[in-house]
């Protein structure tokens, strides 16, 4: 039971995970204009990884795509190719780890295959959370560098007369989805890892002797005690199960019309 | 047709209140932001105070803020200018306006006279 | 506060004649962003309220005639009649529309020759 909990909990903190990292990636606030001890302007500027939008105080707002590849920072297209990478191994882990959930029966597909499968997809959701988490950090530090920068000559203009206001851009709320989202999917993961080594079949069996009663032949199956070996060197113990360890979770249900084929 | 019909205005002594209300029609006044702007007898143009769509953010002229107070009612189509501790160079007329792209006003109301006067 | 400096304060012209006025801000009003200039023109005529002419610098409000146009960016700004009509006696204002407060010029008085 605790297995299924895991890996089910693991998928659906991993769904959400992946949800957030698209929405994040969608977002058009990567960057918004910096309006702490800035003049009140009547315009706000904010950016995300595909356009660049203006609010006016009008309740106006125009967004611009960018449509150039070769124009734009080496950073940025660094971020997109982290947050994409993300998403794709999100989508693809997600896929994966639907047909190694314990509750849905595929076939007649192993327990093996499906402890392989999950592990697949918690190494994928790891690495898509750290992706998300990376490309959100790259973009955080672009920030932080830039802010200093136009904070050094804020107010640039000609012998003082003309002034210039740099717009400043500061965290926008995508930054946090991303982080949360990031961390989430690497949590489902790392649950999902968990989940694997529950579902894995051990190496070592479970050994079941019978016992002989006096005057009774009555086989006595011992169902959660490991016996690596037999007890002692009895001729007549025979071996009833040889099977891996099973706990309740594991044993086999036939399909019903609630189960997904 | 966008229309805004200002009223409220009138004779007050200085130190004295005095609330214009702004009735509009024609659009879509939820969505958008809305302004007042004065002019005094034989003077340019003054804009006194705007407040935007949504949350509803105000702004107002540094020799008005403290003093007047803008506001609105979605639900009535109406726009709001509650003047408090009136002074004689408050004498003008006030128009209400709307906000359009790049926060131009583009709509303007025929104006209400305001006196302030002893 | 954005001072908007209008010039000249009046003019006196004649029919057909191009008119240019002038207005400049203590700030730029060019914004990043979208790299448009937040300045606008209206037109006043008397005993009527203001009418928009122009914003964002250079985009003329429709039903503007074509004759007038706006051009400029950051600080320095102009409106140009191309041919001034009887019917554009008025006074012109150009208006920050970046910064708060929202500030007017002090205004351009037209008046036929």
């Known amino acids: 039971m605790a297995v299924t909990a895991c890996q089910g909990l693991g998928f659906v903190v991993s769904l959400i995970g992946i949800a957030g990292i698209i929405a994040a990636t969608c977002m058009d606030q990567w960057s918004t204009q910096d309006l702490y001890n800035n003049p009140v302007t009547a315009v706000f500027n904010y950016q995300g990884l595909w356009r660049s939008c203006v609010r006016e105080s009008s309740g106006f707002t125009e967004c611009r795509g960018y449509f150039t590849l070769l124009g734009l920072p080496a950073m940025l297209q660094a971020v997109r190719a982290l947050m994409i990478v993300g998403i794709v191994l999100g989508a693809i882990g997600l896929l994966v780890s639907i047909f190694a959930l314990k509750c849905i029966r595929i076939g007649s597909m192993e327990d093996s295959a499906k402890a392989n499968m999950t592990l697949t997809s918690g190494i994928m959701f790891i690495v898509s959370g750290l992706c998300a988490i990376a490309g959100v950090s790259v973009f955080a530090n672009m920030l932080v560098t830039n802010f200093w920068m136009s904070t050094a000559n804020m107010y640039t203009g000609m012998g003082g007369m003309v002034q210039t206001v740099q717009t400043r851009y500061t965290f926008g709320a995508a930054l946090f989805v991303g982080w949360v989202a990031g961390g989430l999917t690497l949590i489902g993961g790392v649950m999902m890892c968990i989940a694997c080594r529950g579902l894995a079949p051990e190496e070592t069996n479970y050994k079941a002797v019978s016992y002989h009663a006096s005057g009774h032949s009555v086989a006595y199956k011992p169902g959660g005690f490991k016996a690596s070996t037999g007890f002692g060197s009895n001729t007549k113990n025979k071996k009833i199960y040889d099977g891996g360890a099973r706990t309740e979770d594991e044993v086999q249900s036939y399909p019903s019309k609630h189960d997904y084929v | 047709e966008v229309q805004l019909v200002e009223s409220g205005g009138g004779l007050v002594k200085p130190g004295g209140s005095l609330r214009l209300s702004c009735a509009a029609s024609g659009f879509t006044f939820s969505n958008s932001a809305v302004s007042w702007v004065r002019q005094a007898p034989g003077k340019g143009l003054e804009w006194v105070s705007s407040i935007t769509s949504g949350v509803s953010y105000t702004y107002y002229a540094d020799s008005v803020k403290g003093r007047f107070t803008i506001s609105r009612d979605n639900a009535k189509n109406s726009l709001y200018l509650q003047m408090n501790s009136l002074r004689a160079e408050d004498t003008a007329v006030y128009y209400c306006?709307?906000?359009?792209?790049?926060?131009?006003?583009?709509?303007w109301g025929q104006g209400t006279s305001v006196t302030v006067s002893s | 506060d954005i001072v908007m400096t209008q010039s000249p304060s009046s003019l006196s012209v004649s029919p057909g004649e191009r008119v240019t006025i002038s207005c400049k801000s203590s700030?730029?009003?060019?914004?990043?962003?979208?790299?448009?200039?937040?300045l606008t023109w209206y037109q006043q005529k008397p005993g009527q309220p203001p009418k928009l002419l122009i914003y964002w610098a250079s985009t003329r409000e429709s039903g503007v005639p074509d004759r007038f146009s706006g051009s400029g960016s950051g600080t320095d700004f102009t409106l140009t009649i191309s041919s001034f009509q009887a019917e554009d006696v008025a006074v012109y204002y150009c208006q920050n529309d970046y910064f708060y407060p929202l500030t007017f010029g002090a205004g351009t008085k037209l008046e036929l020759k």
């Open positions: 700030q730029s009003l060019l914004n990043s962003g979208n790299q448009k200039n937040y």
């Open positions: 306006t709307r906000q359009f792209k790049g926060n131009a006003l583009d709509y």
